[in-house]
Amino acid sequence: IPVIEPSVPELVVKPGATVTLRCVGNGSVEWDGPPSPHWTLYSDGSSSILSTNNATFQNTGTYRCTEPGDPLGGSAAIHLYVKDPARPWNVLAQEVVVFEDQDALLPCLLTDPVLEAGVSLVRVRGRPLMRHTNYSFSPWHGFTIHRAKFIQSQDYQCSALMGGRKVMSISIRLKVQKVIPGPPALTLVPAELVRIRGEAAQIVCSASSVDVNFDVFLQHNNTKLAIPQQSDFHNNRYQKVLTLNLDQVDFQHAGNYSCVASNVQGKHSTSMFFRVVESAYLNLSSEQNLIQEVTVGEGLNLKVMVEAYPGLQGFNWTYLGPFSDHQPEPKLANATTKDTYRHTFTLSLPRLKPSEAGRYSFLARNPGGWRALTFELTLRYPPEVSVIWTFINGSGTLLCAASGYPQPNVTWLQCSGHTDRCDEAQVLQVWDDPYPEVLSQEPFHKVTVQSLLTVETLEHNQTYECRAHNSVGSGSWAFIPISAGAHTHPPDEFLFTP
């Protein structure tokens, strides 16, 4: 901890005296205190000297010496009184600014400690303090008004009894500011506005704050609008409201409207956009592809975005076939409003069945007319495979039929022994059929393909397998020739149950 010389807590001198305050520490030291006049500062390594050769009442104050390099942040202080019979007070501030419920220190420093018994705080022109003003006095620091209130924003003077008469300090203005959490709260309604030319419109900008000192204005495309302001006070808040009424809107009224409010804490603004249109409109769109492919048994949500003015008079989802005349269940149709003019309509299709493939249409109506948006839903299936032995043009032929979606690819395998499924070790031969014959390919249905494998003589201790695969899965059928004809083996897990 630094050491101050002279080593006294208080020093009392007369005006005109020379004062030398020396501070010594282990490392470099620094003096701090009220930046009052006439002091000279001299630093030399681990000591610092604060001196004046002509002390005045203005040098009255507490001077603190610190050692910046000290991790413990130790400091030492000395209070200097410059005892001027004509000046009992050294006032360190013209104005004190605090927030409500803070302590307000009015820095009247007594220049003579002997006068402490006769001090008091008054308002200017000798007026008494307001009732319930709770204050204390310290000769080193001045008067403290505890938990200051906004209403105590006044001009004060410090009074000292000298020779039986009261001597006043110069005045100190106390400004107690209300604790304003931030800029005024704002609302601008509506958040978005659309009108057809000739219709009426209203835009309301309102701001509120705990303090009356704030401004609010409404601007259109950066031009401030001259609108009469309505003021109110409720729920301990001041409210200012600007209402723009337009009887017949035109295109020049369109654009960006900003509601702006400001106070000492800063500025808040919020904006909305006003669109003026020639006539009613209704637009349907989807972020999804209108052509959807989903694996059978899975679920799908179809979403349509609707932008409309005026509002919708009707809407529904319709199934257009081709499989049945069923219609989507209303409980599976969901509508959410994004904002006044934009809505999202969702149709949920859980655990899709084969009969639910096809076209789904969303229809909506407003004064602008009808609009529709149609989705095409195709179901994906893993291949189903079957093999038969037949003669075509007198030649023995294995005929493999595979159906699924997307269109399956076909591969033939010949392997040794009798087996339900050829494994790698058994395979004798593999044939890929790059272009199987398409037997049927209708929209929303499975694609059925046929592949032929001509076999001159069937080897009896061998298995012929037809394998089909697509992006969903694979299927196979094993054909085992036996002496009494032929025997076919679908795999155990062959049957697919959606």
Partner: antibody
Framework: QVQLQESGPGLVKPSETLSLTCTVS????????WSWIRQPAGKGLEWIGR???????NYNPSLKSRVTMSVDTSKNQFSLKLSSMTAADTAVYYC???????????WGQGTMVTVSS | QSVLTQPPSASGTPGQRVTISCSGS????????VNWYQQLPGTAPKLLIY???QRPSGVPDRFSGSKSGTSASLAISGLQSEDEADYFC???????????FGGGTKLTVL
């Protein structure tokens, strides 16, 4: 080490009030005096006023009627409000620590304020 | 119009010694200490000399300050190109009860 950073609007309309904040980092705002100084382009420096962490203020007599300073020790910030702004108030505004015998030993980088409609 | 008076400009060649003056009155320089600030182009001022002749740590000893009566001066010896800047004097003014500055001196290193 202690650093100062001014913040506030770069543009103020005539007759409006300028609000600037100085944030003190790297040290405590407490037990020091803090000043605002301004400098019009190509001109000298002008002291606006100072505030102590207790809220005590002293202002330049030529600006006193328009100036309010406040301090928020919980945020390590002090602020300046200058009302009735005119083109003559266009300047770079600096905040600085004001110390006994050393005057302005640490300065902020400054913020340019233009008064224009 | 600044309270303290400084020459608007000064110049010197590298290695030279230059002096910048600052004159005031008994209300400021006469009864109070003087501080000097250096402002490099496009930057904030920096404390160069405090309490008439004290240098903060980090300031080269080529810079020195002095005060006599109601005038003060800043001397820069061994002038360097990086010394090209504006220099301001400042002091407390008793009757204004606040800080005052000089108008600044632009130092050019030729």
């Amino acid at each position: 080490q202690v650093q100062l950073q001014e913040s506030g609007p770069g543009l103020v309309k005539p007759s409006e009030t300028l609000s600037l904040t100085c944030t003190v980092s790297g040290g405590s705002i407490s037990s020091y005096y803090w000043s605002w100084i301004r400098q019009p382009a190509g001109k000298g420096l002008e002291w606006i006023g100072r505030i102590y962490t207790s809220g005590s203020t002293n202002y330049n007599p030529s600006l006193k009627s328009r100036v309010t300073m406040s301090v928020d020790t919980s945020k390590n910030q002090f602020s300046l409000k200058l009302s009735s702004m005119t083109a003559a108030d266009t300047a770079v505004y600096y905040c600085a620590r004001d110390r006994l015998g050393r005057a302005f030993d640490i300065w902020g980088q400054g913020t340019m304020v233009t008064v224009s409609s | 119009q600044s309270v303290l008076t400084q020459p608007p400009s000064a110049s010197g060649t590298p290695g030279q010694r230059v002096t910048i003056s600052c004159s005031g009155s008994s209300s400021n320089i006469g009864s109070n200490t003087v501080n000097w600030y250096q402002q490099l182009p496009g930057t904030a001022p920096k404390l160069l000399i405090y309490s008439n002749n004290q240098r903060p740590s980090g300031v080269p000893d080529r810079f020195s300050g002095s005060k006599s009566g109601t005038s003060a001066s800043l001397a820069i010896s061994g002038l360097q190109s990086e010394d090209e800047a504006d220099y301001f004097c400042a002091a407390w003014h008793d009757s204004l009860n606040g800080r005052v500055f000089g108008g600044g001196t632009k130092l050019t290193v030729l």
